[in-house]
Interface confidence: low
């Protein structure tokens, strides 16, 4: 066990041309904090592989306003280290992501905006215990300047926080075989022996005689890969052919949780313990939000409409896929409009459009809102070859000349007199009627017969607007 | 496993004062938003009030039925959550549950985990 | 804010019969939530974020809609469904839920 940490020591604009905009303004003061998410190994993640060594984010840094006509500077940090808990063995080679989010303070209901500012990441050898290391690395026009180490919790020592110190049983010197533990030079290293025959590819001790095993291994020696466990249920008897137990229908055979959960039985069925990163029942939906990353190819992510949808990555010209993971034919999207040509130059897409029709995608119907005007704030919609007028409230007509009447349908009932006005409509309702319409006679003893409750609320409910 | 446990109701007057606790626990308290949701007998669900974490600065949310009367707060130290109610009137009858955020981090469902409520009565 | 209406308010299905709730919203939402309440019990998160169900949900249900209408739907309805459902929505501030469809078996 041990900890990663991550130490900030600069944000601001590169050393090269085009110094980007201050993310932070005086009508939008906006403060900045980070996040590092941790991945073992150095090979390529999928898109949606959560942060499976950890994640961390920063406190958040000071209020920042910039100065009018100031170029950006390097943007004030948050205080401390960013640090990531590790539980088992530091794998020596990892990935990360570092990102930089503005938090804009306005007045957002739900809480504030947040917006990724940067985005850097990096694959990397480390030995646990060593010193400092230092990284630049640029995002755009921004830099950011950081270092980073991983240090073992006591009693683990060693490069992968494996090895176990205990303190000295003699003053002196420590037991034969034996080094001192530094930096702990009063402690000695202890005899750490694993079960006998565990793997020493896939398995690990933390305490002598325990066998734990790397992500992806299992059994009691960690020599079974876990796509090939089913000899390891508990259940039912034991098979003489195989030497293992033959399970017994239950719950979590075939392993219902997907993404690498892990099931556990319960009374009355199973429940997935899911990594990182996903949910659900049976760990199939994906969780990443964009904290995460999930964006590759330099898309753009934001949290969805809703607040409980995780994120949507929008792609640069040339990727699609939710993560913008893969690399497309752009033109079999087919961009261009009303039949125009398509052509992929690789850096940019043109289309050649038919005769009749112009723009970047040729989407404008020369036939249509050129040259046509509609009156009265109403705005032209092109399509079909003849132009409409969406007209702004109280006008009508083509082109939005003609006064609309609200109160040509008769809207009032019961004799109920209407009257235009600029929000729409208002009903003066004749003796005994009431209601937005003049819908509901007034009853003599004062009752008024409202409709029946609608669909949901029970009548006597009061009927809340939530 | 998440435990939700809520105390603090009873029978109160109007214009009366009470304070709700939720004792957590099963899940670090600390990385959740929390929430209280009310159900008068007989009736509907209503989302009363919601506390986010502290990288969010404890921001509070009310329902408009309850603003300026009721205060949401909590203490990660005792994975602790409060509804400080006040000048209660008679329509706040209601179950008051407890109800935590589906994940970590002010993500997911808001209302994924419920305690078994307290009851409250307001009436003279 | 947003009013959600469901329908209907009562319902009696018999066992393995198909049972549909609707949620209408007063305006578009982009997710809604599902809760299951029994008499005398919490309401428990039963379908999520429109479609996914939550832990312990038995496969026969399931959920789906968008913009302003959604459902849930039991595809054969047995005795331990019978239980009040409600939906809720938290795309538009504040979080609001319907008034419930009280489904009981026959």
């Known amino acids: 066990a041990g900890v990663f940490e991550l130490q900030i020591h600069s944000f601001g604009p590169g050393p090269g041309p085009g110094a980007p905009r201050s993310p932070c303004s005086a009508r939008l003061p906006c403060r900045l904090f980070f996040r590092v998410c941790l991945k073992p190994g150095l090979s390529e993640e999928a898109a949606e592989s959560p942060c499976a060594l950890g994640a961390a984010l920063s406190a958040r840094g000071p209020v920042y306003t910039e100065q009018p006509g100031a170029p950006a500077p390097d943007l004030p940090l948050p205080d401390g280290l960013l640090q990531v808990p590790f539980r088992d063995a530091w794998p020596g080679t990892f990935s990360f992501i570092i990102e930089t989010w503005r938090e804009e303070l306005g007045d957002q209901i739900g809480g504030p905006a947040w917006s990724l500012l940067a985005r850097v990441a990096g694959r990397r050898r480390l030995a646990a215990g060593g010193p400092w290391a230092r990284d630049i690395q640029r995002a755009g026009a921004w830099e950011l300047r950081f270092s980073y180490r991983a240090r073992c919790e006591p009693p683990a020592v060693g490069t992968a926080c494996t090895r176990l110190c205990r303190p000295r049983s003699a003053p002196s010197r420590c037991g034969p075989g034996l080094r001192p533990c530094a930096p702990l030079e009063d402690e000695c290293e202890a005899p750490l022996v694993c079960r006998a025959g565990c793997s020493p590819e896939h398995g690990f001790c933390e305490q002598p005689g325990e066998c734990r095993c790397l992500e992806g291994w299992t059994g009691p020696l960690c020599t079974v890969p876990v796509s090939t466990s089913s000899c390891l249920s508990p259940r039912g008897p034991s098979s003489a052919t195989t030497g293992c137990l033959v399970p017994g229908p239950g719950p979590c055979d075939g392993n219902p949780c997907a993404n690498g959960g892990s099931c556990s039985e319960t009374p009355r069925s199973f429940e997935c313990t899911c990594p990182r990163g996903f949910y659900g029942l049976r760990c199939e939906v994906s969780g990443v939000t964009c904290a995460d990353g999930p964006c590759f190819n330099g898309g753009l992510c934001v949290g969805g409409a809703d607040p409980d949808s995780a994120y949507i990555c929008h792609c640069p010209p040339g990727f699609q896929g939710s993560n913008c993971e893969k690399r497309v034919d752009r033109c079999s999207l087919q961009p261009c409009r009303n039949g125009g040509l398509c052509l992929d130059l690789g850096h940019a897409l043109r289309c050649r459009c038919r005769a009749g029709f112009a723009g970047p995608r040729c989407e404008h119907d020369l036939d249509d809102c050129a040259g046509r005007a509609c009156a009265n704030g109403g705005t032209c919609v092109e399509g079909g070859g003849a132009h409409r007028c969406s007209c702004a409230l109280g006008f009508g007509g083509r082109d939005c000349r003609e006064r609309a009447d609200p109160c040509a349908a008769r809207p009032c009932a019961h004799g109920g007199r209407c009257y235009a006005h600029f929000s729409g409509l208002v009903c003066a309702c004749a003796p005994g009627y009431m209601g937005a319409r003049c819908e509901f006679p007034v009853h003599p003893d004062g009752a008024s017969a409202l409709p029946a409750a609608p669909p949901g609320l029970r009548p006597g409910d009061p009927q809340r607007y939530l | 496993e998440v435990q939700l446990v809520e105390s603090g109701g009873g029978l109160v007057q109007p214009k009366g004062s009470l304070k709700l606790s939720c004792a957590a626990s099963?899940?670090?308290?600390?990385?959740?938003?929390m929430n209280w949701v009310r159900q008068a007998p007989g009736k509907g669900l209503e989302w009363v009030a919601r506390?986010?974490?502290?990288?969010?600065?404890?921001?509070?949310y009310y329902a408009d039925s309850v603003k300026d009367r009721f205060t949401i707060s909590r203490d990660d130290s005792q994975n602790m959550l409060y509804l400080q109610m006040n000048n209660l009137k008679t329509e706040d009858t209601a179950v008051y549950y407890c109800?935590?955020?589906?994940?970590?981090?002010?993500?997911?469902?808001?209302?994924?985990?419920w305690g078994q409520g307290t009851l409250v009565t307001v009436s003279a | 804010q947003i009013v959600l209406t469901q329908s209907p308010a009562i319902m009696s299905a018999s066992p393995g019969e198909k049972v549909t709730i609707t949620c209408s919203a007063s305006?578009?939402?982009?997710?809604m939530h599902w809760f299951q309440q029994k008499p005398g019990t919490s309401p428990k998160l039963w379908i999520y974020?429109?479609?996914n169900l939550a832990s312990g949900v038995p496969a026969r249900f399931s959920g789906s809609g968008s913009g302003t209408s959604y459902s849930l739907t039991i595809s054969r309805m047995e005795a331990e469904d019978a239980a009040t459902y409600y939906c809720?929505?938290?795309?538009?501030?504040?979080?609001?839920f319907g008034g419930g469809t009280k489904l009981e078996i026959k």
């Open positions: 109800v935590r955020q589906g994940y970590s981090y002010d993500w997911g469902p808001w209302f994924a985990y």
């Open positions: 099963g899940f670090t308290f600390n990385t959740y938003a």
């Open positions: 506390i986010r974490i502290k990288s969010n600065n404890y921001a509070t």
């Open positions: 305006s578009s939402v982009s997710y």
């Open positions: 974020s429109t479609s």
């Open positions: 809720q929505q938290r795309s538009s501030y504040p979080p609001t």
